[in-house]
């Protein structure tokens, strides 16, 4: 029998290589059973995770999982860093693993992108095939 606890499926030590100036969507995969939990994003500053207020977020619902998305429109150089999503569920706070964004500033990027960037770029093409309903918090 599957657990009805909320689960946040960000992978441990996950990373994204992205370009400044591009749009980007950072997904927090959320599994829940009945009521959708309240989910927030924060950005790590040392050992403290600072809640991100006034940022564009949205939900994407799929059959077995939902995604709470933090929108970067566009990505800025200072978006570099580690992020975590958290869910409030039955008075419990559930925290995800952190995920790290490596932002390459287009102005300072060398002509030939790194192997990591090359590997990441094709994904940026197909993730925009999804359509999301956007809202502001």
């Amino acid at each position: 029998k599957e657990s009805c606890d909320v689960q946040l499926y960000i992978k441990r030590q996950s990373e994204h290589s992205i370009l400044a100036g591009d749009p980007f969507e950072l997904e927090c995969p959320v599994k829940y059973c009945a009521n959708r939990p309240h989910v927030t994003w924060c950005k790590l500053n040392g050992t403290t995770c600072v809640k991100l207020e006034d940022r564009q977020t949205s939900w994407k619902e799929e059959k077995n999982i939902s995604f709470f998305i933090l929108h970067f429109e566009p990505v800025l150089p200072n978006d570099n860093g580690s992020y975590r999503c958290s869910a409030n569920f039955q008075s419990n706070l559930i925290e995800s693993h952190s995920t790290t964004l490596y932002v390459t500033d287009v102005k300072s990027a060398s002509e030939r992108p790194s192997k990591d960037e090359m590997a990441s770029r094709p994904w940026l093409l197909y993730r925009h095939h999804h359509h999301h309903h956007h809202h502001h918090h």
Epitope: K11, Q13, S14, E15, H16, K115, A119, W123
Partner: antibody, heavy 120, light 112 residues
Framework: EVQLQQSGAELVKPGASVELSCTAS????????IYWVKQRPEQGLQWIGR????????KYDPRFQDKATLTAEISSNTAHLQLNSLTSEDTAVYFC?????????????WGQGTSVTVSS | AVVMTQTPLTLSVTIGQPASISCKSS???????????LIWLLQRPGQSPMRLIY???KLDSGVPDRFTGSGSGTDFTLKISRVEAEDLGIYYC?????????FGGGTKLEIK
């Protein structure tokens, strides 16, 4: 049942490149990491790197940064390891390994290995 | 890179007797999330490695309880309470805390 099916043995000439594949069944590769591990004849295990198939992001052991390229195709649930500028030092068995389940993501299931022999 | 040092290199054990393998890491393997990402693998002759233990001491399903893992920080031990014939092979420790991930050099378990 979780399975990682690797492509067949390769005999390649020095200086050439080779691409190995690893097709997963019983799970979606986008939900985990895929690791690649090298084992030279009668020797230990070396971690080459990992790919996150969900976004294509890769991490390499610095020793393999210029030797190996990891890619993945979610549509076919397959990961690939490309090895370039092959020398006799690259003669080895290469394993793909599932990066484990949430929340720990530590390697669990191994493929059967692909033997690569570099010889003229 | 984190160096994983396994001892002994070879272990020759009589069936039914205990065995112990040590794995020492050059850096603490305690992660910021409070978990220690140390696993033990067994590679039987002619086979792929298989995971026996993860997070230092958690036994994988199907692994007999004669295997136990212990340790913390930089010092880890795999113990087999009573060695059986199917236990022969090479045992490896592996750390999943730091990049690059690294393996121990292996310990060959032989049956006397």
């Amino acid at each position: 049942e979780v399975q990682l099916q690797q492509s067949g043995a390769e005999l390649v000439k020095p200086g050439a490149s080779v691409e190995l594949s690893c097709t997963a069944s019983g799970f979606n590769i986008k939900d985990t990491y895929i690791y690649w591990v090298k084992q030279r004849p009668e020797q230990g295990l070396q971690w080459i790197g990992r790919i996150d198939p969900a976004n294509g992001h890769t991490k390499y052991d610095p020793r393999f940064q210029d030797k190996a390229t990891l890619t993945a195709e979610i549509s076919s649930n397959t990961a690939h390891l490309q090895l370039n500028s092959l020398t006799s030092e690259d003669t080895a068995v290469y394993f793909c390994v599932r990066g484990g389940d949430h929340p720990y993501y530590v390697m669990d299931w191994w493929g059967q290995g692909t033997s690569v022999t570099v010889s003229s | 890179a984190v160096v994983m040092t396994q001892t002994p290199l070879t272990l020759s054990v009589t069936i039914g007797q205990p065995a112990s393998i040590s794995c020492k890491s050059s850096q603490n393997l305690l992660d910021s999330d409070g978990k220690t990402y140390l696993i033990w693998l067994l590679q039987r002759p002619g086979q792929s490695p298989m995971r026996l233990i993860y997070l230092v001491s958690k036994l994988d399903s199907g692994v007999p309880d004669r295997f136990t893992g212990s340790g913390s920080g930089t010092d880890f031990t795999l113990k087999i309470s009573r060695v059986e014939a199917e236990d022969l092979g090479i045992y490896y420790c592996w750390q999943g805390t730091h990049f690059p991930r690294t393996f121990g050099g292996g310990t060959k378990l032989e049956i006397k």
